[in-house]
């Protein structure tokens, strides 16, 4: 199907010009705006172009058919849907002056929903001011050829089916194509017909394999906890009905009174550890998924979850041990917007006795460790069946403590 434009699993831009013109070159490569989601999959944003307000008015162009191309420097040959249906190739050549005057552009993004039943295309007009004033209709013509190898080069004119796209949100239309499960690996051929103010905009013939365009549902059950070795464990579960393994992008924003940062990581497991967590910080975490071993589209981000750490982090927070054993607690302490250096930390038991300095270890600039040797059985103190171990800054102790059960 060398006359069709293969759809890639990310956003692309369609530019439309009147017929029978000549052009020097297209102005933008590949239609991808600078921040568009790529295969590493970071952030998807489209840049709205600046329009020349002194351009041609639509009223002069009634009943004109604009032939549209995907902006691409290499792709000078632009096969059009209608012409292809009749078995011809139309090469669109456009004068760059006209291009600037009538800069009708659409962002198009298509994907197969995570339930593998619906193929969706979103068509967003970038010519916003104009389409507020005109009746705006979008139709998607599509065909799933029975067996591609035995078909003629182009499907017959009558074989295309048409869906009316829902444009209830102005400037953005949703086109839904039902795809039988058995045909997910087949090549879907389609083209867009956009009508506005009596002007028809028509896309090239596009081809896509739905199975390569799966956009999974967002991961579920995002959960966070501090581990016994002082890391933040983030875990989640894979969305249902996904027929292949996913990779995940996890991003967090760390907001504390001493630093603000955003960081992300791509993993194939459904959990990971964040080390270097800070006391007195909030962590807002989101995760999204994408096919691991082939093309696909990143899911939407999961609903953000927030985890807040205390001003003192003990790890582990509790120890249950037997008489005669040795155990250690670690602590990180933040006080009045400063991380307390580990060499300034002192440890107390039950706020009654200071633990000797000989039992301290400086693990790093900010992590202090205390070790108890050859432990005796805990003596109950009223309703408390444990000893409370406090990490303090000189003579000031935070009200939080670690629990030692012997």
């Amino acid at each position: 199907f060398n006359l069709s434009y293969p759809i890639t699993p990310w956003r692309f831009k369609l530019s439309c010009m009147p017929p029978n013109s000549t052009y020097d070159y297209f102005l933008l490569p590949a239609g991808l705006s600078k921040n568009t989601s790529n295969s590493n999959g970071h952030y998807e944003t489209a840049v709205e172009p600046k329009f020349n307000s002194s351009g041609t008015h639509f009223s002069n162009l009634s009943k004109t058919t604009f032939h549209c191309c995907f902006r691409s420097e290499q792709d000078r040959n632009c096969s059009l849907c209608a012409d292809n249906i009749e078995g011809k190739t139309f090469v669109s050549t456009v004068n760059s002056l006209v291009f600037q005057q009538i800069d009708a552009n659409w962002n198009i993004q298509c994907w197969l929903k995570g339930d593998l039943k619906l193929f969706i295309c979103y068509v967003e007009s970038l010519f916003k001011n104009l389409f507020r004033n005109y009746n705006y209709k979008v139709h998607l013509l599509y065909v799933l050829p029975e067996v591609l190898e035995d078909s003629p080069l182009v499907p017959q004119k009558g074989s295309f089916q048409m869906v009316h796209c829902n444009c209830s949100v102005h400037e953005c239309c949703e086109c839904l194509v039902p795809v039988p499960t058995a045909k997910l690996n087949d090549t879907l051929l389609m083209c867009l017909k956009i009508t506005s103010g009596g002007v028809i905009f028509q896309s090239p013939l596009m081809s896509v394999q739905p199975i390569n365009m799966v956009k999974p549902d967002p991961p579920l059950g995002l959960h966070m906890e501090i581990t016994d070795d002082g890391n933040l464990k983030i875990s989640w579960s894979s969305p249902p009905l996904v027929p292949f393994p996913l990779q995940y992008q996890v991003k967090y924003s760390e907001n504390s009174t001493t630093v603000i940062r955003e960081a992300d990581k791509i993993v194939s497991a459904t959990s990971l550890l964040v080390d270097s967590i800070l006391p007195g910080s909030s962590y807002e975490v989101q995760v999204r998924g994408k096919r691991l071993d082939g093309p696909g589209i990143w899911s939407d981000w999961s609903t953000p979850r927030v985890f807040t750490t205390q001003d003192v982090i003990y790890f582990p927070p509790k120890i249950l041990t037997s008489v005669g054993s040795n155990v250690s607690f670690h602590c990180i302490y933040k006080k009045e917007n400063k991380i307390v250096p580990s060499k300034e930390i002192v440890w107390w038991m039950n706020l009654a006795e200071k633990i000797p300095q000989s039992q301290y270890d400086v693990v790093s600039d900010h992590v202090s460790k205390v070790t108890f040797f050859n432990l005796n059985e805990t003596k109950p103190r009223g309703k408390f069946t444990y000893d409370a171990v406090y990490c303090c800054n000189e003579h000031e102790c935070h009200h939080r403590y670690a629990e030692l059960y012997v």
């Epitope: 504390s256 001493t258 603000i260 940062r261 990581k265 080390d275 270097s276 991380i339 600039d365 900010h366």
Partner: antibody, heavy 118, light 108 residues
Framework: QVQLQQWGAGLFKPSETLSLTCDVY????????WSWIRQPPGKGLEWIGE???????NYNPSLKSRVIISIDTSKNQFSLKMSSVTAADTAVYYC????????????WGQGTLVTVSS | EIVLTQSPGTLSLSPGERATLSCRAS???????LAWYQQKPGQAPRLLIY???SRATGIPDRFSGSGSGTDFTLTISRLEPEDFAVYYC?????????FGQGTKVEIK
């Protein structure tokens, strides 16, 4: 005492990929973010990005599309790769440890002068 | 991104004098997120001040930082010969973290 020792080639042609590595000696490697910063000759400092021990990254958006910072926890080292270099990438490149709990840089490598020239 | 503008570009002073360096941010920076560095020729920068006013480990008390919002100041109360260098401010409250263009403190 923490020491950062960086190494990598110093001369690149336009469009090549710059590669630098930073070895960390002494102190704790775990529990910190590790960063790259550059300084064009006679100019100010520019933060490139950082990576945590667990592999989370945070990049300067102006360089993000060309930069990959990676970490090898078994060797106590982290690396910078910058693709499609141009003359504008000529600079002294520093690796640095990010102060725990802050966005400051408390230990620095010795710096590597990277020149991009055809 | 937050742009930090340092002034003056060069400060010519004699040992024993007081140096006042300014750093102005293009938008408000919480005082918790501002730092100062010293850099001598051929060397890596050295952290002096973090959180606008806290001295880093081993930094003499003649160095002090102050300010909030968009205006921050580094003061060297009595210049020692080893203090003649370039000084940079840095913000880390908004990504990307950015540095000022530097103030050179030279011997008059």
């Amino acid at each position: 005492q923490v020491q950062l020792q960086q190494w990598g080639a110093g001369l690149f042609k336009p469009s090549e990929t710059l590669s630098l590595t930073c070895d960390v000696y002494g102190g704790s490697f775990r529990g910190y973010y590790w960063s790259w910063i550059r300084q064009p000759p006679g100019k100010g400092l520019e933060w490139i990005g950082e990576i945590s021990y667990s592999g989370f990254t945070n990049y300067n958006p102006s360089l993000k599309s060309r930069v990959i910072i990676s970490i090898d926890t078994s060797k106590n080292q982290f690396s910078l790769k910058m693709s499609s270099v141009t003359a504008a990438d000529t600079a002294v490149y520093y690796c640095a440890r990010v102060t725990y709990g802050y966005g400051t840089f408390d230990y620095w490598g010795q710096g590597t002068l990277v020149t991009v020239s055809s | 991104e937050i742009v930090l503008t340092q002034s003056p570009g060069t400060l010519s002073l004699s040992p024993g004098e007081r140096a006042t360096l300014s750093c102005r941010a293009s938008q408000s920076v919480s005082s918790s997120y501002l730092a100062w560095y010293q850099q001598k020729p051929g060397q890596a920068p050295r952290l002096l001040i973090y959180g606008a006013s806290s001295r880093a480990t081993g930094i003499p008390d003649r160095f002090s930082g102050s300010g909030s919002g968009t205006d921050f100041t580094l003061t060297i109360s009595r210049l020692e010969p080893e203090d003649f260098a370039v000084y940079y401010c840095q913000q880390y409250g908004s990504s990307p973290w950015t540095f000022g263009q530097g103030t050179k403190v030279e011997i008059k």
